[in-house]
């Protein structure tokens, strides 16, 4: 077991791709969520609030992503065996304090049935 193992189903497979679910507390207002493959940053999403409670969503490393009030989903497509690895949701919480950086992760197993283009 890895330190910070996700206590929920982190990987959801569909159509030869995978949705990687990164949960965060619903009380969190401003944060940055990074998806790490091993130690490499694959994707990130930052949510901040400006004056008048205007919400800003930014990505420096863009992936197809989906934001809800307690999770960020990152989507990876065209799965192959090279995608098998440890993936981590690296969450930086800016608001409310205390500021903290937390890790949640799991191993993505790739099975033949989940590949996008199986050879018949």
């Amino acid at each position: 077991e890895i330190n910070g193992s996700a206590n929920y189903e982190m990987f959801i497979f569909h159509n030869g791709g995978v949705q990687i679910l990164c949960k965060y507390p619903d009380i969190v207002q401003q944060f940055k969520m990074q998806l790490l493959k091993g130690g490499q940053i694959l994707c990130d999403l930052t949510k901040t609030k400006g004056s008048g409670n205007t919400v800003s969503i930014k990505s420096l490393k863009f992936c197809h992503s989906q934001l809800s009030n307690n999770s960020v989903s990152f989507f990876l497509y065209n799965l192959d065996h090279s995608h098998a690895n440890y993936y981590f949701c690296n969450l930086s919480i800016f608001d409310p304090p205390p500021f903290k950086v937390t890790l949640t992760g799991g191993y993505l197993h790739i099975y033949e049935s989940q590949l996008c283009c199986q050879l018949k």
């Epitope: 996700a6 409310p96 304090p97 950086v101």
Partner: antibody, heavy 121, light 112 residues
């Protein structure tokens, strides 16, 4: 009323692994709270060890990070602490506590009653 | 890490008299939302710590109104308007602005 109760061995040998559990009663561990461990060596002050959210997200004190693992078991409504390679310096009363976010801050309320762990050969 | 420094180390008090404890942080605990991220705890002899004050000046539920917290930025004070015998113990300040969460070294309040 939320209550926390620590349990685990009170005596350990050097180089062993400390394992403690904190049982949560009167409320759900899946609430919007971070669950922390804090320790207090005999006659000394308080030191924050780390915390976990019910999803499994963890955050540790840098000084202990290489030796600490905190995990959560939602089915048993409890969370646990493991501290590896212990020495006499890890002798302390270990407390579990809830980060009380419903008052806008990480304030600890309530605390467990604490359990004394002694490391000695 | 934010370093928290408390003074005095020990405080002999007379019941009915006021008492004051100081806490200083190595960096400002004032967040852009206007709150100071500082708590005060009391650890009575043989007991677990209990929350007295959160966000610098807010009394926790059930805490008598003789306890008050004040200050902003890096300098904070816990005041007891009239000390009672049950107030003896060690008082700790703690910053909750960022992790690692850090505590002051404690102030031991005892009856003269």
């Amino acid at each position: 009323q939320l209550q926390l109760q620590e349990s685990g061995p009170g005596l350990l040998k050097p180089s062993g692994t400390l394992s403690l559990t904190c049982a949560v009663s009167g409320g759900s561990i899946s609430s919007s709270s971070w669950w922390s461990w804090v320790r207090q060596p005999p006659g000394k002050g308080l030191e924050w060890i780390g915390e976990i959210y019910h999803t499994g997200s963890t955050n540790y004190s840098p000084s202990l990070k290489s030796r600490v693992t905190i995990s959560v078991d939602k089915s048993k409504n409890q969370f646990s602490l493991k501290l590896s390679s212990v020495t006499a310096a890890d002798t302390a009363v270990y407390y579990c506590a809830r980060g009380h976010y419903d008052i806008l801050t990480g304030s600890f309320d309530p605390w467990g009653q604490g359990t004394l762990v002694t490391v000695s050969s | 890490d934010i370093v928290m420094t408390q003074s005095p180390l020990s405080l002999p008090v007379t019941p009915g008299e006021p008492a004051s404890i100081s806490c200083r942080s190595s960096q400002s605990l004032l967040h852009s939302n206007g709150y100071n991220y500082l708590d005060w705890y009391l650890q009575k002899p043989g007991q677990s710590p209990q929350l007295l004050i959160y966000l610098g000046s807010n009394r926790a539920s059930g805490v008598p109104d003789r306890f008050s917290g004040s200050g902003s930025g890096t300098d904070f004070t816990l005041k007891i308007s009239r000390v009672e015998a049950e107030d003896v113990g060690v008082y700790y300040c703690m910053q909750t602005l960022q992790t690692p969460l850090t505590f002051g070294g404690g102030t031991k309040v005892e009856i003269k």
